[in-house]
Interface confidence: medium
């Protein structure tokens, strides 16, 4: 198991690709001075500076890793889902466009 050590109770996060059965037990950094600031729910950057980031896909914010990613529409890929796949969907490539 992983230890639980939370300086400030973080918002309920989702783990690997948004969710898993195990919640990661994490240590959230920040001392007294940052406490009030960290208790406020962090803005989802997908609703702000990354609002138009994903061209052919949906912006997702993986809060527990503080990472923005794009969930691409079928046949699109790339960091911003801006590239169109020329391949037909084989067993191997199909998961790239989930």
């Amino acid at each position: 198991s992983v230890r639980v050590e939370q300086v400030v109770k973080p918002p309920q996060n989702k783990t690997e690709s948004e969710n898993t059965s195990d919640k990661p037990k994490r240590k959230k950094k920040g001392g007294k001075n940052g406490k009030n600031r960290r208790n406020r729910k962090k803005k989802n950057p997908c609703n702000a500076e990354f609002q138009n980031f994903c061209i052919h896909g949906e912006c997702k914010y993986i809060e527990h890793l503080e990472a923005v990613t794009c969930k691409c529409q079928q046949e699109y890929f790339g960091e911003r889902c801006g590239e169109k796949s020329m391949k037909t969907h084989s067993m191997i490539d199909s998961s790239l466009s989930k």
Epitope: S1, V2, P10, N13, T15, E16, S17, E18, N19, T20, S21, D22, K23, P24, K25, R26, K27, K28, K29, G30, G57, K60, I62, H64, L65, E66, A67, V68, T69, C70, K71, C72, F77, G78, E79, R80, C81, M91, I92, S95, L96, S97, K98
Partner: antibody
Framework: EVQLVESGGGLVKPGGSLRLSCAAS????????MSWVRQAPEKGLEWVST????????YYPDSVKGRFTISRDNAKNSLYLQMNSLRAEDTAVYYC?????????????????WGQGTTVTVSS | DVVMTQSPLSLPVTLGDPASISCRSS???????????LHWYQQRPGQSPKLLIY???NRFDGVPDRFSGSGSGTDFTLKISRVEAEDVGVYYC?????????FGQGTKLEIK
């Protein structure tokens, strides 16, 4: 070229401390969660810690609980591992690894870039 | 913790022959979105590990198509269709569905 270079390993006595560093280059360091993975002599791989892109969240297995601290300095493109109360069983090659790539619809595709490793030996 | 069990631990293969490595997890690696975070890494002698296959069956950039991954739930397989000399090394399966992330013990592939 995407590269991770570890440093800071060495010989330390049980109970001692060591700070490992990992210098990243060739990619936008601040966009990637980072991890440390270790490999004891003639043994397999063991995950040691992970830190989120901004350094807010850190994760550890029980084997290093309360003893190791992962941190990062995005301005310096650097990852760190502070190791305290070291034990003989912490002897290993420590690898810095990037978690990614963060695209194609789901962010976690495994650790796609690894450093060459730095050796930590804990012995009296 | 999720225990990853690989077999065989040693795999002597003749050049050009196929090879297969099994990896079994102590619990399902499918998350609530239906994704399975099972990866395979290759570690050549004296080198750092390299990502080979991610999410069960996806070859990472530059990985030859003789490598393939399959499986679901708790049972997974890495196959090499025709073993080449450069494939010698240790192969690890790893899961990142559940924290802590865990690795298999490794399978050492060697040429007969």
């Amino acid at each position: 070229e995407v590269q991770l270079v570890e440093s800071g390993g060495g010989l330390v006595k049980p109970g001692g401390s060591l700070r490992l560093s990992c210098a990243a280059s060739g990619f936008t360091f601040s966009s990637y969660p980072m991890s440390w993975v270790r490999q004891a002599p003639e043994k397999g791989l063991e995950w040691v810690s992970t830190i989120s892109t901004g350094g807010t969240y850190t994760y550890y297995p029980d084997s290093v609980k309360g003893r190791f601290t992962i941190s990062r300095d995005n301005a310096k493109n650097s990852l760190y591992l502070q190791m305290n109360s070291l034990r003989a069983e912490d002897t290993a090659v420590y690898y810095c690894a990037r978690q990614g790539p963060i695209y194609y619809g789901n962010y976690y595709y495994g650790m796609d870039v690894w450093g060459q490793g730095t050796t930590v030996t804990v012995s009296s | 913790d999720v225990v990853m069990t690989q077999s065989p631990l040693s795999l002597p293969v003749t050049l050009g022959d196929p090879a297969s490595i099994s990896c079994r997890s102590s619990q399902s690696l499918v998350n609530q979105e239906g994704e399975t975070y099972l990866h395979w890494y290759q570690q050549r002698p004296g080198q750092s590990p390299k990502l080979l296959i991610y999410k069960v069956s996806n070859r990472f950039d530059g990985v030859p198509d003789r490598f393939s991954g399959s499986g679901s739930g708790t049972d997974f397989t890495l196959k090499i269709s025709r073993v080449e000399a450069e494939d010698v090394g240790v192969y690890y399966c790893s899961q990142s569905t559940h924290v802590p992330y865990t690795f298999g013990q490794g399978t050492k592939l060697e040429i007969k």
